[in-house]
């Protein structure tokens, strides 16, 4: 993918609301282009915070103002509604509601939209076409919640348009505005170190790869040209500068480490893989 983001691409907004008791609550809202955070919500000023220079996409100031207003009112209304119906729905304090909604793009075309609500980390209800539906496993509480949410068809119509129209228009504009940033290629740095000893006579070899962009990367411990199937890849973790970090580990008998190497493949390297040999690695670190 030329945009440096794995297909399918998505834009989604996540709302995490914590209800500690009847009067004390807190919420966190963020906007994400796939796994890159692009927006956050400032609860104090009720404004959208743009985290990247291109986070506005191609939406006008007027459109942002309108979305801000809509978001502010819906947040207030959601808090009011959940607090009002908490007892009826058997929501027990403290509890957490998580909502995620957005749309997906596949090969430049809209492939779908989604809006899901979870209660205490479990699927509860989702928005399909023009109304809220309960997850079967969520039981009668979820059915009742849908009844409440579906009272206002006008709000559901607006939600449908936000998901099926506004979101796809926005994601296309966002990709265009952020093209230079998203298409950039940043070369990884790699280094080797010892991990904690797995046991007597054994070593844990660690290959660190950091500072690369985009995210897809291939890292493997090798013996000559042979991939070592015992290679354990960690999660690819974000760095503060928007690049990524990964570590790959391998456990071996102390005498078998000499001819091992770590190989790194990444699009920024243009076929020139990084190869680091354990025998050349200094014992410091």
């Amino acid at each position: 993918n030329a945009d440096g983001l794995k297909e399918p691409l998505s834009f989604h907004v996540t709302w995490i609301a914590s209800f500690y008791n009847h009067s004390w609550k807190q919420n966190l809202v963020s906007g994400w282009l796939s796994d890159l955070q692009t927006h956050t919500w400032d609860s104090n000023s009720s404004t959208i915070v743009f985290l990247c220079p291109w986070s506005r996409g191609n939406f006008s100031n007027e459109e942002w103002k309108e979305l801000e207003t809509l978001f502010r009112i819906r947040t207030i209304r959601s808090f009011e509604g959940i607090r009002r119906y908490a007892h009826e729905l058997q929501f027990e304090y403290p509890f957490e509601i998580q909502v995620t909604g957005g749309c997906e793009l596949h090969s430049g075309k809209v492939s779908g939209s989604f809006l899901q609500l979870a209660y205490q980390g479990s699927d509860f209800v989702s928005f399909q076409n023009n109304s809220w539906l309960p997850y079967p496993v969520a039981g009668n509480m979820a059915k009742h919640f849908c009844k409440v949410l579906n009272q206002n068809q006008h709000e559901n119509d607006i939600t449908h348009n936000l998901l099926s129209d506004t979101c796809p228009r926005f994601i296309l504009g966002l990709l265009d505005a952020g093209k230079a940033h998203l298409q950039r290629q940043v070369k990884p740095e790699a280094w080797l170190s010892h991990g904690p000893s797995p046991g007597p006579g054994h070593l844990q070899l660690v290959c660190h790869v950091s500072g690369f962009y985009p995210k897809p990367v291939w890292v493997m411990w090798m013996r000559g040209e042979q991939e070592q199937q015992g290679t354990q890849r960690g999660d690819i973790l974000p760095s503060a500068d928007g690049t990524w970090y990964l570590r790959a580990t391998l456990e071996v008998a102390a005498g078998e480490a000499a001819d091992l190497s770590c190989r790194v493949k990444h699009s920024s390297l243009e076929g020139q893989d990084i190869v680091l040999y354990w025998e050349h690695h200094s014992s410091v670190g």
């Epitope: 207003t69 809509l70 209304r77 068809q153 119509d157 348009n161 129209d165």
Partner: antibody
Framework: QVQLQESGAGLLKPSETLSLTCAVY????????WSWIRQPPGKGLEWIGY???????NYNPSLKSRVTISVDTSKNQFSLKLSSVTAADTAVYYC???????????WGQGTLVTVSS | DIQMTQSPSSLSASVGDRVTITCRAS??????LNWYQQKPGKAPKLLIY???SLQSGVPSRFSGSGSGTDFTLTISSLQPEDFATYYC?????????FGQGTKVEIK
């Protein structure tokens, strides 16, 4: 700043069909709800219906059986048809733009439609 | 449909007066309440949206408050150009409905 302008016949006979068009100049046509609102002489405002720019519609139940709103995005305009008019349909008809929150932030200047035999 | 009731239906005031118009909804509408000003022969003009947000270009002497069922439009210091009819409108559910209007006249 978006500007709206209504056009259409100002004088109708009972049972005829009222037909008005609203041209939208400047600003974006996408992402908005385009409404028709009317005001009988000396009276209050009544919402007739809206069309979302992508084509979905919503009508006032009190007029639903007689109303059709359509859109032509290539011309940045939308239209109102109200069938079987009576003297009670005599009013100034306004077209208006609304964002998701359904407040009407831009209005046409209004056109008086009189129904008289 | 949600009924919107404005009071008073008319009032007389002088330039410089503080004027308050109230609007009551027949059911809770959260903050989905908007205010308009209309002068004779002209289209309505949006003053306040979402109960308390001032529309761009509207003087700061206009303010809105309230949530649920009871809302207020306040003009802090009435100016000659403010003599007009004011309407509230709910946008909580369709059909959007308007109050019957409050006419502000010169005393």
């Amino acid at each position: 700043q978006v500007q709206l302008q209504e056009s259409g016949a100002g004088l109708l006979k009972p049972s005829e069909t009222l037909s008005l068009t609203c041209a939208v100049y400047g600003g974006s046509f996408s992402g908005y709800y385009w409404s028709w609102i009317r005001q009988p002489p000396g009276k209050g405002l009544e919402w007739i219906g809206y069309i979302y720019y992508s084509g979905s519609t919503n009508y006032n139940p009190s007029l639903k059986s007689r109303v059709t709103i359509s859109v032509d995005t290539s011309k940045n305009q939308f239209s109102l048809k109200l069938s079987s008019v009576t003297a009670a349909d005599t009013a100034v008809y306004y077209c208006a733009k609304a964002p998701y929150m359904m407040y009407f932030d831009s209005w046409g200047q209004g056109t008086l439609v009189t129904v008289s035999s | 449909d949600i009924q919107m009731t404005q009071s008073p239906s008319s009032l007389s005031a002088s330039v410089g007066d503080r004027v308050t118009i109230t609007c009551r909804a027949s059911q809770s509408i959260s903050s989905y309440l908007n205010w308009y000003q209309q002068k004779p022969g002209k289209a309505p003009k949006l003053l306040i949206y979402a109960a308390s947000s001032l529309q761009s270009g509207v003087p700061s002497r206009f303010s809105g408050s309230g949530s649920g069922t009871d809302f207020t439009l306040t003009i802090s210091s009435l100016q000659p150009e403010d003599f007009a009819t004011y309407y509230c409108q709910q946008s909580y559910s369709t059909p959007p409905t308007f109050g019957q209007g409050t006419k502000v006249e010169i005393k």
